[in-house]
């Protein structure tokens, strides 16, 4: 699997009314990635 993105300290930047993470880390914290093996909806990104 691809290395997880670095998301230490949640990595959130705050703007008026919105926030943004440094990266989209949802894949690394997805249900499918948690399965670790077998066929997963989020295969490693090329």
């Amino acid at each position: 699997l691809a290395d997880p993105l670095d998301h230490r300290d949640a990595g959130d930047l705050w703007f008026p009314g919105e926030s943004e993470s440094f990266e989209d880390a949802h894949v690394e914290h997805s249900i499918s990635r948690s399965l670790l093996e077998g066929e997963i909806p989020f295969p490693p990104t090329s």
């Epitope: 949640a10 989209d24 949802h26 894949v27 914290h29 249900i31 499918s32 670790l36 989020f42």
Partner: antibody
Framework: EVQLVESGGGLVQPGGSLKLSCATS????????MHWVRQASGKGLEWIAH??????????YYAESVKGRFTISRDDSKTTIYLQMNSLKTEDTAVYYC?????WGQGTTVTVSS | DVVMTQSPLSLPVTPGEPASISCRSS???????????LYWYLQKPGQSPQLLIY???NLASGIPDRFSGSGSGTDFTLKISRVEAEDVGVYYC?????????FGPGTKVEIK
């Protein structure tokens, strides 16, 4: 087999409260980020809440439309997430889905009406 | 908020023919690591949404390769190379980079 099963929906009067549950199974739960997304009848999808993992101090985020009224939480020991909904409004009427963004539950219907 | 728009909102299709749906975001969804936080879902009638494409161009597992995603930082396209009857439903694009996360209004695909 991955399963996400929502429950707790029903009919409630405006100003009332409901607590939705989403029981999960079939995958290691503790590191997964979870969300609630809702859909009013015949309308599109609206993201409303997000909870991260223990390693992220269970950080939570909300849509402005529910901020201060809804609370997302999780119990890692029960592999369940929750949505406490207070001060409900008629516009909260919708099907509520729990999701990891890849897998989705079947939804539970909340109707707010007098 | 990041506004997601889609066109067309309704798309009559012919089985065996190609189809294309456009999505535009009001700001770039490209991150510093080259990831584009754009996702496509299909909600078939009476069902929950299902993931088709993640991070703009990655095909979700179990999804037929007739589906593909492409685009830039703000303009995205979902293509179906050969539409099948089972592809009917509402297609949504979504961004999961900036809070609040937002979905497009949906494109209803139906057989002519």
């Amino acid at each position: 087999e991955v399963q996400l099963v929502e429950s707790g929906g029903g009919l409630v009067q405006p100003g009332g409260s409901l607590k939705l549950s989403c029981a999960t199974s079939g995958f290691p739960f503790s590191n997964v980020w979870m969300h609630w997304v809702r859909q009013a009848s015949g309308k599109g999808l609206e993201w409303i809440a997000h909870i991260k993992a223990k390693s992220d101090n269970y950080a939570t985020y909300y849509a402005e439309s529910v901020k201060g009224r809804f609370t997302i939480s999780r119990d890692d020991s029960k592999t369940t997430i929750y949505l406490q909904m207070n001060s409900l409004k008629t516009e909260d009427t919708a099907v509520y889905y729990c999701t990891g963004l890849d897998y989705w539950g079947q939804g539970t219907t909340v109707t707010v009406s007098s | 908020d990041v506004v997601m728009t889609q066109s067309p909102l309704s798309l009559p299709v012919t089985p065996g023919e190609p189809a294309s749906i456009s999505c535009r975001s009001s700001r770039s969804l490209l991150t510093s690591k080259g990831i584009t936080s754009l996702y496509w879902y299909l909600q078939k009638p009476g069902q929950s949404p299902q993931l088709l494409i993640y991070r703009m161009s990655n095909l979700a597992s179990g999804i037929p390769d007739r589906f593909s995603g492409s685009g830039s930082g703000t303009d995205f396209t979902l293509k179906i190379s050969r539409v099948e009857a089972e592809d009917v439903g509402v297609y949504y694009c979504a961004q999961f980079l900036v809070y609040p996360y937002t979905f497009g209004p949906g494109t209803k695909v139906e057989i002519k």
